[in-house]
């Protein structure tokens, strides 16, 4: 297995939040004498070995902060200790794990490493890590909010934002698909009897429409937008797209946008078919997110 | 530079105990496994136990479970091994050694200055 | 408990000679999630502390001179002086870390 860091540099703001997130993939032995540890924790610039030194978070070593999986059990970690120092490690069925810091400082600038071991019943460890760098900054020349720059084997040549790898987008929709889908089968029986229209079913997937444009020389990546809502139609031109195998890399990630999908418009809201129809739009894409993203 | 000193040689009766210390420098003392191991004179290495500092945790060869104590001391980034009921078999020179493990086990990169036990009466 | 046998258990070779050491572990100490052996080799020099020289099996610890070679898979492990100095006078240990922490009785290398 490897380890991805999607960004190589978070930018942020005194006082704001930020998640730094890494993503496992690869062959994954699941046997039951096999047990994942991912955690986190801070290394030196200027190493031979990067993040090879190794210091603690906040004041919490990578022990407080791991995320630990047995053959087939859920990550759980000492959750408690880290929300007290403002930290919160996650992780979800994807490979995606993450760390979220909150209310940062200037202290909290650094060289963060993401970690995943291996180890084997009565066995050492395999360990691969993956790093990225935290600027947080004050003053005038702060940005707004955390602007997040691609790493380098992921940066775009040309100088608009980079597309998304293959990976981050199977695993944003995966799992946007599986909240979606378990949302709206939790709704549905309410749906009949309930006589006001139903909640709009929305897929949020990042959008590159509030992309925060840098005079860096690398720019934030697509990925860093907020989430947008897709129209019904947008659906199954998106999922179709994605079955084929394009690499998404325009403003929903759908190559040629314009000739297939329509400008993106609000959702709909109707109740009865309309909304049936729409659970079934979602449904065909989610199904086809999860055949091309299960090829990977 | 990363760097463990030991404390002096101690000269006991057979029965009593002894703890011996072990202070890092250099690096993130809660961050990494500290490791002792028995040297008898002339002899090879024997790994008696480890203890993660963060948590204060340790782990120990079970030939050495009922003789050995492991602690830490945060505040002052050091390490400490009781030996208790000693015997002339624990006449020694004794070192505590840094391995760089997450959770399993891994080499030693950094080794103390060693400590000689000497059990007579 | 994995077993480390060395041998020989001593040698005597003048300066400027090659040297080689063994080790055998009683299992496999190679992982095969990475294919790397969970070996080291450490120098002890008369009245220090052992030194790292080598993990791995044969990945050289940095400022250890290149006359230094480790070598070998699975359970057969060697240590290798291309060209012995005098300074190499030494107690040489083999440490397993695959499944806790096992270590060979040593070679003991004198200089004619």
């Known amino acids: 297995f490897k380890v991805a860091t999607l960004y190589s540099l978070y930018v942020c703001p005194e006082g704001q939040n930020v998640t730094l997130t890494c993503r496992v993939f690869g062959p994954v032995d699941k046997g039951h004498d096999v047990t994942f540890y991912k955690t986190w924790y801070r290394s030196s610039r200027g190493e031979v070995q990067t993040c090879s030194e190794r210091r603690p978070i906040r004041n919490l070593t990578f022990q407080d902060l791991h995320l630990h999986h047995g053959g087939h059990q859920a990550a759980n970690t000492s959750h408690d200790l880290a929300q007290r120092h403002g930290l919160e490690s996650a992780s979800d069925h994807h490979g995606n794990f993450s760390i979220t810091m909150r209310n940062l400082t200037l202290l909290d600038s650094g060289l963060y490493c993401c970690l995943v071991v291996e180890i084997r019943h009565h066995h050492s460890e395999h360990r691969v890590h993956g790093a990225m760098e935290l600027q947080v900054q004050t003053g005038k020349d702060a940005p707004s909010s955390c602007v997040a720059y691609p790493s380098s084997s992921q940066e775009s040549e040309s100088k608009g934002p980079s597309s998304c790898p293959f990976w981050v987008i199977c695993s944003l929709l995966s799992s946007s698909c599986t909240q979606t889908l378990f949302g709206t089968l939790a709704l549905s029986p309410q749906a009949h009897r309930n006589p006001s229209p139903p909640p709009p079913l929305l897929l949020h997937i990042p959008s590159a429409s509030s992309l925060v444009q840098s005079p860096e020389a690398h720019s934030p990546s697509i990925c860093s937008g907020v989430s947008a809502p897709l129209a019904s139609l947008e659906w199954l031109c998106l999922g179709s797209h994605l079955w084929l195998g394009k690499v998404p890399h325009d403003r929903y990630w759908v190559p040629q946008a314009a000739k297939c999908c329509p400008s993106h418009q609000p959702p709909m809201t109707s109740e009865g078919w309309g909304s049936r129809i729409q659970l079934l739009q979602i449904s065909v894409f989610c199904v086809s997110v999860f055949l091309r993203c299960s090829l990977l | 530079q990363v760097q463990l000193k030991q404390s002096g040689a101690e000269l006991v009766r057979p029965g009593a105990s002894v703890k011996l210390s072990c202070k890092a420098s250099g690096y993130s003392f809660t961050d990494y496994y500290i490791n002792w191991v028995k040297q008898r004179p002339g002899q090879g290495l024997e790994w008696i136990a480890r203890i993660f500092p963060g948590s204060g945790n340790a782990y120990y060869n079970e030939k050495f479970k009922d003789k050995a104590t492991l602690t830490v001391e945060k505040s002052s980034s050091a390490a400490y091994m009781q030996l208790s009921s000693l015997t002339s078999e624990d006449s020694a020179v004794y070192f505590c050694?840094?391995?760089?493990?997450?959770?399993?086990?891994?080499?030693?990169?950094?080794w103390g200055t060693g400590t000689t036990v000497t059990v007579s009466s | 408990n994995i077993m480390m046998t060395q041998s020989p258990s001593s040698l005597a070779v003048s300066a400027g000679e090659k040297v080689t050491m063994s080790c055998k572990s009683s299992?496999?100490?190679?992982?095969?999630?990475?294919?790397?052996?969970?070996l080291a080799w450490y120098q002890q020099k008369p009245g220090q502390s052992p030194k790292l020289l080598i993990y791995w099996a044969s990945t050289r610890e940095s400022g250890v001179p290149d006359r230094f070679t480790g070598s070998g898979s699975g359970t057969d492990f060697t240590l290798t002086i291309s060209s012995v100095q005098a300074e190499d006078l030494a107690v040489y240990y083999c440490h397993q870390y695959l499944s806790s922490y096992t270590f060979g009785g040593g070679t003991k290398l004198e200089i004619k």
């Open positions: 050694a840094r391995d760089d493990s997450f959770y399993g086990y891994w080499y030693f990169d950094v």
């Open positions: 299992q496999s100490v190679l992982y095969s999630s990475n294919q790397k052996n969970y």
